[in-house]
């Protein structure tokens, strides 16, 4: 089948890194500079992605694969393929529409990206709190209270003054 197909369509013989050049009697021509084709049988080569500004090059473009970008220090990638760079915040903060804001009591963020999240409720998984949470760290859950040996005690975090939430986004 493949042989039959290639007789019918000469372009199917063109490997990755080339394109089927209609202007040259459908022969396989190498992709021009700053372009690539990642699969065979392509009639055009795709333009290489350019990592400019807040983007920096993680992997150079080759004739068979696109460039890959990441973000300069102080920023992190968002979206598949790092389609956007977003400002970092500190741990214990989240990025809102008004800039970086500290996590509210009862919430934490252990990364430089993302949101402040409520501390894990250990009791929902039948466990107890071994270590209290902070703005930067979730609580650490341990064995269930029934599993603790006599005399051992677990640390119970102070009850939040209100339902754990986070600063406005």
């Amino acid at each position: 089948f493949e042989r039959t197909r290639s007789l019918q369509d000469p372009c199917s013989n063109c490997p990755a890194g080339t394109f089927c050049d209609n202007n040259r009697n459908q022969i396989c021509s190498p992709c021009p500079p700053n372009s690539f084709s990642s699969a065979g049988g392509q009639r055009t080569c795709d333009i290489c992605r350019q990592c400019k500004g807040v983007f920096r090059t993680r992997k150079e473009c080759s004739s068979t694969s696109n460039a890959e970008c990441d973000c300069t220090p102080g920023f992190h990638c968002l979206g598949a393929g790092c389609s956007m760079c977003e400002q970092d915040c500190k741990q214990g903060q989240e990025l809102t529409k008004k800039g970086c804001k500290d996590c509210c009591f009862g919430t934490f963020n252990d990364q430089k990206r993302g949101i402040c999240r409520p501390w894990t409720n250990c009791s929902l998984d039948g466990k107890s709190v071994l270590v209290n949470g902070t703005k930067e760290r979730d609580v650490v859950c341990g064995p269930s209270p029934a599993d603790l040996s006599p005399g051992a005690s677990s640390v119970t975090p102070p009850a939040p003054a209100r339902e754990p939430g986070h600063s406005p986004q």
């Epitope: 992190h76 990638c77 968002l78 979206g79 598949a80 977003e86 989240e94 990025l95 809102t96 529409k97 919430t107 252990d110 990364q111 990206r113 993302g114 949101i115 999240r117 409520p118 501390w119 894990t120 929902l124 998984d125 979730d138 609580v139 859950c141 339902e163 754990p164 939430g165 986070h166 406005p168 986004q169």
Partner: antibody, heavy 120, light 106 residues
Framework: QMQLVQSGAEVKKPGASVKVSCKAS????????MHWVRQAPGQGLEWMGW????????NYAQKFQGRVTITRDTSASTAYMELSSLRSEDTAVYYC?????????????WGQATLVTVSS | SYELTQPPSVSVAPGKTARITCGGN??????VHWYQQKPGQAPVLVIY???DRPSGIPERFSGSNSGNTATLTISRVEAGDEADYYC?????????FGGGTQLTVL
């Protein structure tokens, strides 16, 4: 390429439990929160909860607290969702979804779905 | 708990512009994400953080968010855009979805 592959369809009796798996590939499993979302036939999307694969920390929707348990096996890059005390209303398609990290929790990669049917 | 309200259905002729709204109290202060779901398929993120497009999503898809309404706009609508669309936000420890809008291309 990022991919989430879920376990196959399940048929359960009322009162039983079901455990659905979600195997991640193509990215650092521990670096991104994993969520579970379900969709009853002909209905909308309903969020169930998340897990932080790095720490194992969880957060569940109030509706499912006490019935759902989300766990992970980092060595296998796999998250699990177990739902207990099943009833007919739990018949739904269940999805795992990776959080992309944008402000306000975006779900940028979804599993292919697992159909759970609860019937006596 | 926070609620998001979407119209159940929106109809549009091919080539025209479709607008799908998502209402919520002071939703403009939140980050809104939009998903497209075709029959028998998993949802796909089409807009995140109000107006940003993931790679691979056509420029015809755009979003805005202010006051009490977020809007997904699809310009030059094609038959392949026919699907259910869901808005979603994060609110005080919960992920919240709108009820969904069925987009019909006439």
């Amino acid at each position: 390429q990022m991919q989430l592959v879920q376990s196959g369809a399940e048929v359960k009796k009322p009162g039983a439990s079901v455990k659905v798996s979600c195997k991640a590939s193509g990215y650092n499993f521990s670096g991104y929160y994993m969520h579970w979302v379900r969709q009853a036939p002909g209905q909308g999307l309903e969020w169930m909860g998340w897990i932080n694969p790095k720490s194992g920390g969880t957060n569940y929707a109030q509706k499912f607290q006490g019935r759902v348990t989300i766990t992970r096996d980092t060595s296998a890059s796999t998250a699990y969702m177990e739902l207990s005390s099943l009833r007919s209303e739990d018949t739904a398609v269940y999805y795992c979804a990776r959080e992309g990290g944008a402000r306000g929790v975006d779900l940028d990669t979804w599993g292919q779905a697992t159909l759970v049917t609860v019937s006596s | 708990s926070y609620e998001l309200t979407q119209p159940p259905s929106v109809s549009v002729a091919p080539g025209k512009t479709a607008r799908i709204t998502c209402g919520g109290n002071n939703i403009g202060s939140k980050s809104v994400h939009w998903y497209q779901q075709k029959p028998g398929q998993a949802p796909v993120l089409v807009i995140y953080y109000d107006s940003d497009r993931p790679s691979g999503i056509p420029e015809r898809f755009s979003g805005s968010n202010s006051g009490n309404t977020a809007t997904l706009t699809i310009s030059r609508v094609e038959a392949g855009d026919e699907a259910d669309y869901y808005c979603q936000v994060w609110d005080s420890s919960s992920v919240v979805f709108g009820g969904g809008t069925q987009l019909t291309v006439l």
